[in-house]
């Protein structure tokens, strides 16, 4: 497991192995096997399953081992700690970023990463792309930043800054994560928009005919969505009539802010026999399926 921090800030890391809170945990410098003390007067010391760097230095970077001593088994975890110098500019490099949060709600909250490991007191200060957030739309509450009326303009890198208190001394901690805005999707039972239910279409014998089947499924969440044709309850490809073909692929479109699919049935030259067939437009997705049956009649 990897952890990182910034020079001259507090860094607290937790043993990657988990055990009962009553089990003793010992920490070591992995390369020297030297034990790390528990006395708080040291700059680096152990507190139960946590290793504290107060403050951290670049030279603290390295691999640390923690051993959880339980009655029947010792479990060892390894932690790769990297302490970086503060970036000189506002561009935060990827290696200092915590996981990206994706917002789709109109009102969204961003959590300050790792804050639960620290002895912090409110308020937490928040910055976006290094600028302090002062608009009333941005509200800091506990370890969260609430953003009201989220828009794509709110995308960017958000940094939280708070104070860790230990033995009467305060230490700064900062953490940054990206925020991206996603359109809120919704999925619904398919709706066939064309052809209408029990529709009859006029065709000319000997002439080509095309029938479009269009259905909508919601916005951005059309799982297992498909639109297809059947002839007399048989998939077109298995019907055995070369003159009648379903177009390859599905045309995607939007209608009234919904995602829709269209499949086209082509008849190269309509015959009398075609007038006696049933043509079914089927739309299906995760929620279920629906069919509209149409017939052909001579113009």
């Amino acid at each position: 497991k990897s952890s990182w921090g910034l020079e001259n800030e507090a860094l607290i890391v937790r043993c990657p192995q988990r055990g009962r809170s009553t089990y003793p945990v010992e920490w070591y410098y992995s390369d020297t096997n030297e034990s790390i003390p528990t006395q708080k007067r040291n700059r680096i010391f152990v507190s139960r399953d946590r290793l504290k760097f107060l403050p951290a230095r670049v030279e603290d970077s390295g691999i640390y081992a923690c051993v959880i001593r339980s009655p029947n088994l010792n479990k060892t975890g390894y932690l790769n700690v990297t302490i970086h110098k503060k970036p000189p500019s506002c561009n935060i490099p990827d290696y200092l970023m915590y996981s990206t949060v994706r917002g789709s709600d109109k009102n969204f909250k961003i959590t300050c990463p790792t804050i639960d490991l620290y002895n912090w007191t409110a308020p937490v200060q928040w910055f976006k792309n290094c600028k302090a957030l002062q608009e009333p739309r941005f509200r800091a509450h506990r370890s969260y930043l609430f953003i009201d009326n989220v828009t794509h303009d709110d995308e960017g890198d958000y940094t939280c800054q708070f104070t860790h208190a230990e033995n009467g001394t305060n230490y700064i901690v900062t953490a940054t994560r990206s925020f991206t805005v996603e359109e809120k999707g919704f999925s619904m039972f398919p709706v066939i928009t064309n052809p209408p239910y029990n529709h009859t279409m006029e065709v000319e014998i000997g002439k080509p005919a095309s029938i479009a089947c269009s259905a909508c499924f919601g916005k951005g969440s059309h799982f297992l969505a498909d639109v297809l044709w059947q002839i007399n309850k048989t998939v077109v490809g298995n019907f055995g009539e070369a003159r009648i073909q379903e177009e390859e692929g599905r045309n995607e479109s939007s209608s009234n802010d919904m995602d829709c699919l269209t499949s086209v049935l082509r008849i190269t030259g309509v015959t009398e026999k075609d007038l006696s067939l049933e043509y079914d437009c089927l739309a299906l997705n995760l929620h279920g399926m629906i069919r509209h049956t149409i017939r052909l009649r001579r113009k």
Epitope: L224, L286, R291
Partner: antibody, heavy 116, light 107 residues
């Protein structure tokens, strides 16, 4: 309470036909897809196909297309999986499951053994 | 069809340890992924749906994450009853497919 109850274990000879069932209760049977899943001895789960009982529309996995037939009788809230001619390689546990953004309810499974 | 590859095939851990199971899709399935647990002689049981939503009655130690092609099921601290086989399954596009499974066994 939503339940899917499957028919009992079957022992058949190669070449014989078989139809196993899955009865749904506690929900609107015609409004949810019912899928069939095969698990051969000591192996993983394989999706075979699915039916929408409200319309009896079926969709098969390419591996099972033409090998089995899925059907439903909505009047008795029951879905079926059938073989016209069993092979020894059809020996497996077969599960039915309701699909609603995931297979949220499963039948207890029907063990089919095909042996001469 | 979309192929789901689970790793590792077997995970040997002790009770109390953290289990991390991976499921990789051959193409994006967005967040249309579910995780199931199966114990010997039992039907599979739904744990997680839409990549990160816990099913009704599933303990908080089970969590799912990921979207697109890479997904993770995490069991924060293994209980004796968690030793089983775990499957991922996608329902983004037809045909629906399952991963080959990861067996979590007692070390």
């Amino acid at each position: 309470e939503v339940q899917l109850v499957q028919s009992g274990a079957e022992v058949k000879k190669p070449g014989e036909s078989l139809k196993i069932s899955c009865k749904g209760s506690g929900y609107s049977f015609t409004s949810y897809w019912i899928g069939w899943v095969r698990q051969m001895p000591g192996k993983g789960l394989e999706w075979m196909g699915i039916i929408y009982p409200g319309d009896s529309y079926t969709r098969y996995s390419p591996s099972f297309q033409g090998q089995v037939t899925i059907s439903a009788d909505k009047s008795i809230s029951t879905a079926y999986l059938q073989w016209s001619s069993l092979k020894a390689s059809d020996t497996a546990m077969y599960y039915c499951a309701r699909l609603s953004g995931r297979f949220d309810y499963w039948g207890q499974g029907t063990l089919v053994t095909v042996s001469s | 069809e979309i192929v789901l590859t689970q790793s590792p095939a077997t995970l040997s851990l002790s009770p109390g340890e953290r289990a991390t199971l991976s499921c990789r899709a051959s193409q994006s399935v967005r967040d249309a992924l579910a995780w199931y647990q199966q114990k010997p002689g039992q039907a599979p049981r739904l744990l997680i749906y839409f990549a990160s939503n816990r099913a009704t009655g599933i303990p908080a130690r089970f969590s799912g994450s990921g979207s697109g092609t890479d997904f993770t099921l995490t069991i924060s601290s293994l209980e004796p009853e968690d030793f089983a086989v775990y499957y991922c399954q996608q329902f983004n596009t037809w045909p629906i497919t399952f991963g080959q499974g990861t067996k979590v066994e007692i070390k």
